[in-house]
Amino acid sequence: QEDEDGDYEELVLALRSEEDGLAEAPEHGTTATFHRCAKDPWRLPGTYVVVLKEETHLSQSERTARRLQAQAARRGYLTKILHVFHGLLPGFLVKMSGDLLELALKLPHVDYIEEDSSVFAQSIPWNLERITPPRYRADEYQPPDGGSLVEVYLLDTSIQSDHREIEGRVMVTDFENVPEEDGTRFHRQASKCDSHGTHLAGVVSGRDAGVAKGASMRSLRVLNCQGKGTVSGTLIGLEFIRKSQLVQPVGPLVVLLPLAGGYSRVLNAACQRLARAGVVLVTAAGNFRDDACLYSPASAPEVITVGATNAQDQPVTLGTLGTNFGRCVDLFAPGEDIIGASSDCSTCFVSQSGTSQAAAHVAGIAAMMLSAEPELTLAELRQRLIHFSAKDVINEAWFPEDQRVLTPNLVAALPPSTHGAGWQLFCRTVWSAHSGPTRMATAVARCAPDEELLSCSSFSRSGKRRGERMEAQGGKLVCRAHNAFGGEGVYAIARCCLLPQANCSVHTAPPAEASMGTRVHCHQQGHVLTGCSSHWEVEDLGTHKPPVLRPRGQPNQCVGHREASIHASCCHAPGLECKVKEHGIPAPQEQVTVACEEGWTLTGCSALPGTSHVLGAYAVDNTCVVRSRDVSTTGSTSEGAVTAVAICCRSRHLAQASQELQ
């Protein structure tokens, strides 16, 4: 999820060359940027995270901090260095006047500065009346492996670790970084202070109401008795986890972040670093009935972001608000009236609701999956969580209309067996941020580092788009969609798959001169077609041209409109086989779909022809969806004819490897 998401503010403060006292100037041409929370009441002016460039050493961080203090003192300002970061991100946390920001932005090594802001527990209400514990049938829920090889870190409130439900399962670390409680008459009542964290620890690993009954947990206190914390406190907590991991490497680690604040570049960056160090992070999508991309850490792409549903698989309403939604949500999980340990007494249970509870469910499921398969990477785990989810059970009418297509209709579930899914070719759909409406606007969708981009498509609600293409960026393929003049903006949609030992490339055919249309195929030996994209420069793509039909018996070929350039994604991987499946409807139809059959995985989804009345194509689970303009506004019948083209693949290699293991 890009930095330009939502209302996130970026204030670029210009460098003034006349500023004194600089022994080293920043590299020429670079301007450090200042960021702050878009939600004004959550801002914490006076405390700033100064993030230094990636390769900055600890000694340089300390020197830069000292330099800031010295230069501030010369101007008569007091500053206090609260923390020097190293291990995750280089930088420091400083308490200072906002007047010093211009000065700080000019310091050597500075990448950006972010004003501190608040984060909040994501459960409502905190304490209901006590309720009796749930009753379980003897064999109702006896998972084969309770997550015993996995350690789950919980960044939350303090917790009552000797509650009967979690005693011996939770180690309270000595980490604490919380702000003062608001209000002069706030009374710290221990059971209230412990409420949120105790409940979540119970949901993850409780003896009787927990998901991963064998998982051990470690708690870090980053939320105060009112359930409020800071971005900086959370960052220092994440750094503590990284340092613990380095000092004493254990098995797989899951970090549960049942909190949310406004979009934070620095919090997302820290999550990215920790994820790339092999840690699985699970977070609450947020309880604001809003786009999760506007919140952190929910908007961090490397984090597994969880929305909340109820027992009827409907999105959870929380007072006037409810679960967040949108493309930054990975999946949903139970988050309404969830029974768990209550800090009111050592045997009490209580029900709480929210995306915190949903995230705790997924953290528990992740712990169980990792305990069964400790070598799973984050990408593999995320793909499995998506694969085993209940599909298409959420009533999407609850979401705002423009968010429905972006929000995954997935409710987390435990796999039927924690072993034996290795043969599957796993793919997921990743939507980009909206491009914006300018003529040359583009949107980019990216896969995770160890996923392969197997196809790329685009979608525009207005239908005014110029297609999409796969292109190399930083040594990896990305999916870029192009807006058209008068268009309200586009989305790029990447199909991201787990394909070990894959060698993929893009073959392009420029627009054809002849009327037969443009074609491109995979000509390398052993390469198979996994996806087709088309991109055009003209504003209105052949509104009255007849549709191009694929020649029979040429499965490795992409075909498209003669005015478009066509891009074929061609991959070679052990045992990979793919086939093209089409579903054409002669009459105008708002939506045409085609699905891959059991045992095959959808890797590519595109529309034939790519004419302007087609809004775009995208994959939903194993189904390719092609959307067209409202049929009432469509012209002739021939123009209304649309074909959905799915490319379905499977890996015989993965299937064989799985059988050999069994």
Epitope: P133, A138, D162, E167, G168, M171, T347
Partner: antibody, heavy 115, light 109 residues
Amino acid sequence: QIQLVQSGAEVKKPGASVKVSCKASGYPLTSYGISWVRQAPGQGLEWMGWISAYNGNTNYAQKVQGSVTMTTDTSTSTVYMELRSLRSDDTAVYYCARGYGMDVWGQGTTVTVSS
Amino acid sequence: QSALTQPASVSGSPGQSITISCTGTSSDVGGYNSVSWYQQYPGKPPKLKIYEVSNRPSGVSNRFSGSKSGNTASLTISGLQAEDEADYFCSSYTSTSMVFGGGTKLTVL
């Protein structure tokens, strides 16, 4: 290693009080409470209650409610169980055990109530 | 009288398997995953053998196993040995407290 060490045997007259101590070591104390269990001669085990080493909260069995008080001294990692208004049927071996799971036990303290 | 019912005595020959039952209600054994089994030698404190229905603490022989069906929990000792002769107690959570069984004396013939 993980240990619970209890105070020595006590002989008390009916109506008196007794205070038994249990010193914990070898594990993070706040992760577990302490349960107290007694066993009358030739009889089974009876759970008396539990105290939190984290916040001092208690949970007493109905049968002994009103006559038992459990306390904790975090500075010495010691938990105490005081039984008041002793009667002859309070004669038993009193055990402290770690948490509700009672996975580690003290060696036991014999309390004899006799006139 | 104990809340959980156990047979007063059970016996078996060396090498045999025996099972001790522990019957409660849906408010204790049937309602929770937290049934434990303890072994006690005369004059000694009890020792945990099984926790959470079927889990063995480290160091406990795999000859000891636990299970539960409905409101009844069971302890099975296979390959009976002379040193298994002792008293065995089950325990379970209730909504607010803990309950023990009356105990079973195991005799190895």
